[in-house]
């Protein structure tokens, strides 16, 4: 069948019909429904929500909706033995204790099963010792502490402020520095925007608010006990000592009221510069230990959380494609939340729900997409992207052969300033073209396109007249699809003004105060930004599933490959003498990029000219486009990170949230001047250049004429 036979709505009308069916009021209603009680992964409440979503997706008209369950390692506080931190005096008496829970927001005082703030997967322990303040606990912060300030964290409890990097990286860095415990806190400098009131009177973090979150270093492994394979009924599970990515020292999060009590007594070295000072009225001394009068006092952690194998449930909905049912476009976002999930994830889940409803409406009118669309409500994202990863592990053979694209749908908003998109370069043109067709919801841009407001507010640093599109990193459910399987991926949400708001994420992230009211009162009362995000996410899915020729432009990959090659070369050229000594050359990489550019250009010309009515040739060309992302996968993975297999992009080794380009070369060059064996270190740089050059060349050849 041709694609026109797959529908009784004219092709031009298809997208408009789909977009017109999306309603802000429905998203609002769904968000309310999803946020009235907590939906923590592994709980009965979240299982019930999975069944509700399954039922509603069936009602909306999907062909099938199934639950996919897995038994994975999760982590919970001990209900009878709470976690807390103390200041103890020389006699061991607790003279100060941190709070055991967040004061509940108005209207939620009687809600049960609000999990108290904890760091998921922290081991149990009661370490006591002197405190060292380590700023954000980034790699560079520990370099400054150890190299410039000569502060040894070995045997110390470190206190780090949230922000800048993924919390798991903070814990890993602290472990490597020899710390015996980690306290994480939210500093007002990062989580309290000036001129805004704290919740419930505004969207800022109150002093008793605390950010929950997992502290794993999974590097894409999924369930810590079954890396590489699904955690199904017959799974072989590793012992806890062999589990992937678990922290080895106790970790606990606190709010800034409690942090003040710990930090105000700090002695030792002054902060190295003002970037180490937050907004509390404390000196931000680094330590170790407390100042003069309090020098005999210590800090003690009391952590009693347990790791438990627990059942989780994904909801997988299918809308079968009429022409190419064996080609999958996936829209997925998670359902589990730390507490109410007002923003994370339910502002995303509500958008997915409305997108499913709109697609279902079209299907009931007789329309089908050209390709199959899979919709997913993932479980246990907050515990390490577990639901999505286990499902992808279980279905990896299908996905690597049939996966066209994955669009992620976590939080729809983290602000209300402008659009934010991270995606594969293959999707740049799709995103540009789509946003040019959508109306901007922004004040002052009435009657203007989304592309125009987005470009004005978030301009590309390289290309004038174009918006910024960022690299994919990780920290969300696209990870397994993109970084492991090489399926073209993208994500979109509304964000804050990064120029004026320097706080990390949004202030109430992962706190009890992330409620429906937070969104409805302060972020998006008209749900117009949610609707825009629904249009972007849904529009991308629609085009990916329905375009006769896949809306991928391989020339955009050529452009970024050159940019990334230039960038990594300039990093290496900071060591000109060593490059000469060890004969380090980037010629092979630049040559491969040049070849890729030429072949991509020729492929694009053929794409314009070929006979689209010939289904075999059409399928062949589309397969070359689909498999291009796959061609950047190295089956051996990156060094020490076997599940990060994409050679062009990986999550930064220093911040899971950030994407790094040519990560193999980047990591080989990182801090190379401090390596004990320079010959070996530069040898690894050369090997990584070789791997990158080969991969780019091999990917280019997949775009060559097949015979």
């Amino acid at each position: 069948k041709s694609s026109n036979e797959a529908t009784n709505i004219t092709p031009k009308h298809n997208m408009k019909a789909f977009l017109d069916e999306l309603k802000a009021e429905n998203i609002k209603k769904f968000l309310y429904n999803f946020t009235q009680i907590p939906h923590l992964a592994g709980t009965e409440q979240n299982f019930q929500l999975a069944k509700q979503i399954q039922s509603q997706w069936k009602e909306f008209g999907l062909d099938s909706v199934e639950l996919a369950h897995y038994d994975v390692l999760l982590s919970y506080p001990n209900k009878t033995h709470p976690n807390y931190i103390s200041i103890i005096n020389e006699d061991g008496n607790e003279i100060f204790n941190t709070s055991l829970f967040e004061p509940p927001p108005p209207g939620y005082e009687n809600v049960s099963d609000i999990v108290p703030p904890f760091s998921a997967f922290s081991p149990q322990g009661m370490p006591e010792g002197d405190l060292v303040y380590v700023n954000y606990a980034r790699t560079e912060d520990f370099f400054k502490l150890e190299r410039d300030m000569k502060i040894n964290c070995s045997g110390k409890i470190v206190i780090a402020r949230y922000g800048k990097v993924f919390r798991g990286n903070k814990v890993k860095n602290a472990q490597l520095a020899g710390a015996k415990g980690v306290i994480l806190y939210s500093d007002p400098a990062d989580y309290f925007a000036p001129g805004v009131k704290s919740y419930p009177d505004g969207w800022n973090l109150p002093g008793g608010g605390v950010q929950r979150g997992n502290i794993l270093n999974l590097n894409g492994a999924g369930d810590p006990l079954t890396p590489g394979y699904p955690a199904n009924e017959y799974a072989y599970r590793r012992g806890i000592a062999e589990a992937v990515g678990l922290p080895s020292i106790p970790v606990h999060p606190i709010g800034y009221y409690d942090a003040q009590k710990l930090l105000e007594k700090m002695g030792g070295s002054a902060p190295p510069d003002s970037s180490w000072r937050g907004s509390l009225k404390v000196p931000y001394n680094v330590g170790p230990g407390f100042t003069g009068n309090f020098s005999t006092q210590k800090v003690k952690m009391h952590i009693h959380s347990t790791n438990e194998v627990t059942r989780i449930y994904n909801v997988i909905g299918t809308l079968r494609g009429a022409v190419e049912p064996d080609r999958y476009v996936i829209l997925g976002g998670h359902r589990d939340s730390w507490v109410f999930g007002g923003i994370d994830p339910q502002s995303g889940a509500a958008v997915v729900h409305e997108i499913v409803r709109s697609f279902g409406t079209l299907k009931k009118e007789g329309w089908r997409p050209r390709r199959t669309i899979l919709f997913a409500s993932w479980d246990a994202e907050e515990f390490g992207l577990l639901g999505s990863t286990e499902w992808a592990e279980e279905n990896s053979r299908l996905l690597q052969e049939r996966g066209v694209a994955y669009i992620n749908a976590d939080s729809s908003i983290e602000g209300n300033y402008t659009l934010r998109v991270d995606c594969t370069p293959l999707m740049y043109s799709l995103v540009h073209n789509l946003t040019k067709e959508l109306k901007s919801p922004d004040e002052g841009f009435e009657g203007k396109s989304l592309y125009e407001s987005w470009t004005k507010k978030s301009p590309s640093p390289e290309f004038s007249g174009m918006p910024r599109i960022s690299k994919l990193g990780s920290g969300n459910d696209f990870e397994v699809f993109f970084q492991r399987l090489g399926i073209a991926s993208g994500r979109a949400r509304y964000t804050k003004n990064w120029e004026t708001n320097k706080f990390s994420g949004y202030p109430l992230y992962h706190s009890v105060y992330e409620t429906y009211e937070l969104v409805e009162k302060f972020y998006d009362p008209m749900f117009k930004y949610h609707l825009t995000v629904a249009q972007v996410r849904g529009g991308m899915v629609f085009e990916l599933a329905n375009s006769i020729v896949l809306p991928f432009d391989c020339r955009d990959y050529a452009v970024v490959l050159r940019k990334y090659a230039d960038k990594i070369y300039s990093i290496s050229m900071k060591h000109p003498q060593e490059m000469k000594t060890y004969s380090v050359s980037f010629d092979s990489l630049f040559s491969a990029v040049k070849n890729f550019t030429e072949i991509a250009s020729k492929f694009s010309e053929r794409l314009q000219d070929f006979d689209k009515s010939n289904p075999i040739v059409l399928r062949m060309m589309n397969d070359q486009l689909m498999f291009l992302e796959r061609a950047f996968i190295d089956p051996l993975g990156l060094p020490d990170r076997p599940f990060y297999r994409h050679v062009i992009y990986a999550p930064s080794s220093h911040n899971k949230y950030a994407g790094e380009s040519f990560p193999g070369i980047y990591d080989a060059l990182f801090d190379i001047e401090s390596k004990v064996d320079p010959s070996k270190a530069w040898g690894e740089v050369k090997r990584q250049i070789y791997v990158a050059a080969f991969t780019v060349q091999a990917a280019a050849e997949t775009l060559s004429e097949v015979a």
Epitope: R147, D148, M149, K150, I151, G268, S269, A270, P272, D273, S274, S275, R277, V286
Partner: antibody
Framework: EVQLVQSGAEVKKPGESLKISCKGS????????IGWVRQMPGKGLEWMGI????????RYSPSFQGQVTISADKSISTAYLQWSSLKASDTAMYYC??????????????WGQGTLVTVSS | QSVLTQPPSVSGAPGQRVTISCTGS?????????VHWYQQLPGTAPKLLIY???NRPSGVPDRFSGSKSGTSASLAITGLQAEDEADYYC???????????FGTGTKVTVL
């Protein structure tokens, strides 16, 4: 009492080598950075470089990199500043100074009395 | 050549207030590094006067005070006394040089 005692004045000819010293006492010598500062006749202070005797980590001002060598012998709590080939323009008063703590970014709270180096043919 | 600029000289009558400015850049004072001040009496080694922008070591009279804003810092001497006649130097870490820099120095004269 915390103090830094520097070696005596030196008169040298151009091309000669020289090593001046700075002995610390009254504190844990290995736990504090020691910096060197030059003051040419009638001129201001110039930061030359710094050493952490605990691990011999040494940092130089770009202006002095390759011109002088800073070292320390922790067994005798002494820091050194040396030249392999003096020039007339090296004529100056040289001060050693201890940082206030183990941090490179701390101020210098204890200073030596200075060593006058005169280079003349 | 110093990257911290001070006025070559300031003067004041006994009892007066004088201030010395220290202007840096985005790689030193403006980067958030602390500013320290030293006093050098004629023929002696420098002495720490102010550390961490505004802190006085014990023994330094409270007539001396320091402040910092943006890419500049200043030292104020109130109730100027004859024994304050000396050279004064500011100091800050500079990230572009990976080391410390001193100011050009200011001679304070008590009239």
């Amino acid at each position: 009492e915390v103090q830094l005692v520097q070696s005596g004045a030196e008169v040298k000819k151009p091309g000669e080598s020289l090593k001046i010293s700075c002995k610390g006492s009254g504190y844990s010598f290995t736990s504090y950075w020691i910096g060197w500062v030059r003051q040419m006749p009638g001129k201001g202070l110039e930061w030359m470089g710094i050493i952490y005797p605990g691990d011999s980590d040494t940092r130089y001002s770009p202006s002095f990199q390759g011109q002088v060598t800073i070292s320390a012998d922790k067994s005798i709590s002494t820091a050194y500043l040396q030249w392999s080939s003096l020039k007339a323009s090296d004529t100056a008063m040289y001060y050693c100074a201890r940082s206030m703590g183990s941090s490179l970014y701390a101020s210098s709270d204890v200073w030596g009395q200075g060593t006058l180096v005169t280079v003349s043919s | 050549q110093s990257v911290l600029t001070q006025p070559p000289s300031v003067s004041g009558a006994p009892g007066q207030r004088v201030t010395i400015s220290c202007t840096g850049s985005s790689s030193n004072i403006g980067a958030g590094y602390d500013v320290h001040w030293y006093q050098q009496l004629p023929g002696t080694a420098p002495k720490l006067l102010i550390y961490g922008n505004s802190n006085r070591p014990s023994g330094v009279p409270d007539r001396f005070s320091g402040s910092k804003s943006g890419t500049s810092a200043s030292l104020a001497i109130t109730g100027l006394q004859a024994e304050d006649e000396a050279d004064y130097y500011c100091q800050s870490y500079d990230s572009s040089l990976s080391g410390y820099v001193f100011g050009t120095g200011t001679k304070v004269t008590v009239l």
